[in-house]
Amino acid sequence: APVPPGEDSKDVAAPHRQPLTSSERIDKQIRYILDGISALRKETCNKSNMCESSKEALAENNLNLPKMAEKDGCFQSGFNEETCLVKIITGLLEFEVYLEYLQNRFESSEEQARAVQMSTKVLIQFLQKKAKNLDAITTPDPTTNASLLTKLQAQNQWLQDMTTHLILRSFKEFLQSSLRALRQM
């Protein structure tokens, strides 16, 4: 697993370097998670032919994965910093149950899956410190999450692999959109 942000050898070797700003730390954290997702996607794609699945088939899924929409204020047109930040944090909180589902799903990248999960928790904390309107952030219901996780794990093998592929793809897209939006803040 890659070394988490702020723990690489360059940081140790350069004690006089300016500490990272909050925005830089968030940027670095997202890029670190995206690297982790790439490694997980690599294993998934090597294991099965899921990655060749058509966009149409993937669109017809029973999941309710977070997705950026125009109304969320994260796109260049109609950009709204506060609305967007709330959407990013809410979306990441909603992704947590899906990241839990990914645990124990990887043979050679087991540590990587755990790192993505833990780094996302840290990213949420960073972003919550940045947000002014924490009351607008809705936390998913733990009971609903528990039954969703049970339902996902009950699926047949092919469906589980499709679900894994879709979660990774959607999480990557969500993080990329978030990264672009956060760089405008």
Partner: antibody, heavy 121, light 111 residues
Framework: EVKLEESGGGLVQPGGSMKLSCAAS????????MDWVRQSPDKGLEWVAE??????????YYTKSVRGRFTISRDDSKSSVYLQMNNLGAEDTGIYYC????????????WGQGTTLTVSS | DIVLTQSPASLAVSLGQRATISCRAS??????????MNWFQQKPGQPPKLLIY???NQGSGVPARFSGSGSGTDFSLNIHPMEEDDTAMYFC?????????FGGGTKLEIK
């Protein structure tokens, strides 16, 4: 050629135990999920238990009526799946089939011939 | 759990005619554009034999007179033309998720 062969059935008294075995051949067993399905005259076909391959968690699933009494296990080195049945009742009487769900679609494409369990005093 | 209601419980069809068996699921068995509904034929003293998988695909070596259709919660198995060898029990089964469930069965006979 895929083959599934069950063994271990017979007559057992209520409250007793029995262990069924299923020997598989003709496919990569360690990658496969394996299931037990039973059939009784009054209940028709009923799925009993499933054991999954590594990287799928939880690894075992059971139908409600057998949970806590039955245990499904596997030995990849022997290409075998087992069903340990404890505290048996008359309602467990039936033909027990070992079956394999196909990766694409999860349908049971191969079945063993079945082994009969009779629970009676 | 997904409950499968199969109808009719028994059916008598003349040789050469069409037999239609229905299966209704208590919730959708669809996902990713696929329907996880399967059909089995069973003759006395034999294990079930796969006829149709994922709603409309024929199992290996299954004659073309067997066809399946449907999506979501409503499915059907069609046998046309009916042959003597088709006298058997027929079951629908969902393979979307555990607990995998079966319909109660349809006994098909020749009229």
């Amino acid at each position: 050629e895929v083959k599934l062969e069950e063994s271990g059935g017979g007559l057992v008294q209520p409250g007793g135990s029995m262990k069924l075995s299923c020997a598989a051949s003709g496919f990569t067993f360690s990658d496969a999920w394996m299931d037990w399905v039973r059939q009784s005259p009054d209940k028709g076909l009923e799925w009993v238990a499933e054991i999954r391959s590594k990287t799928y968690h939880p690894a075992t699933y059971y139908t409600k009526s057998v949970r806590g009494r039955f245990t499904i296990s596997r030995d990849d080195s022997k290409s075998s799946v087992y069903l340990q049945m404890n505290n048996l009742g008359a309602e467990d009487t039936g033909i027990y089939y070992c079956t394999r769900p196909r990766y694409y679609g999860g349908y049971f494409d191969y079945w063993g011939q079945g082994t009969t369990l009779t629970v009676s005093s | 759990d997904i409950v499968l209601t199969q109808s009719p419980a028994s059916l008598a069809v003349s040789l050469g005619q069409r037999a239609t068996i229905s299966c209704r699921a208590s919730e959708s068995v669809d996902n990713y554009g696929m329907s996880f509904m399967n059909w089995f034929q069973q003759k006395p003293g034999q294990p079930p034999k796969l006829l149709i998988y994922t709603a409309s695909n024929q199992g290996s070596g299954v004659p073309a007179r067997f066809s399946g259709s449907g999506s979501g919660t409503d499915f059907s198995l069609n046998i046309h033309p009916m042959e003597e060898d088709d006298t058997a029990m027929y079951f629908c089964q969902q393979s979307k998720e555990v607990p995998y469930t079966f319909g109660g069965g349809t006994k098909l006979e020749i009229k």
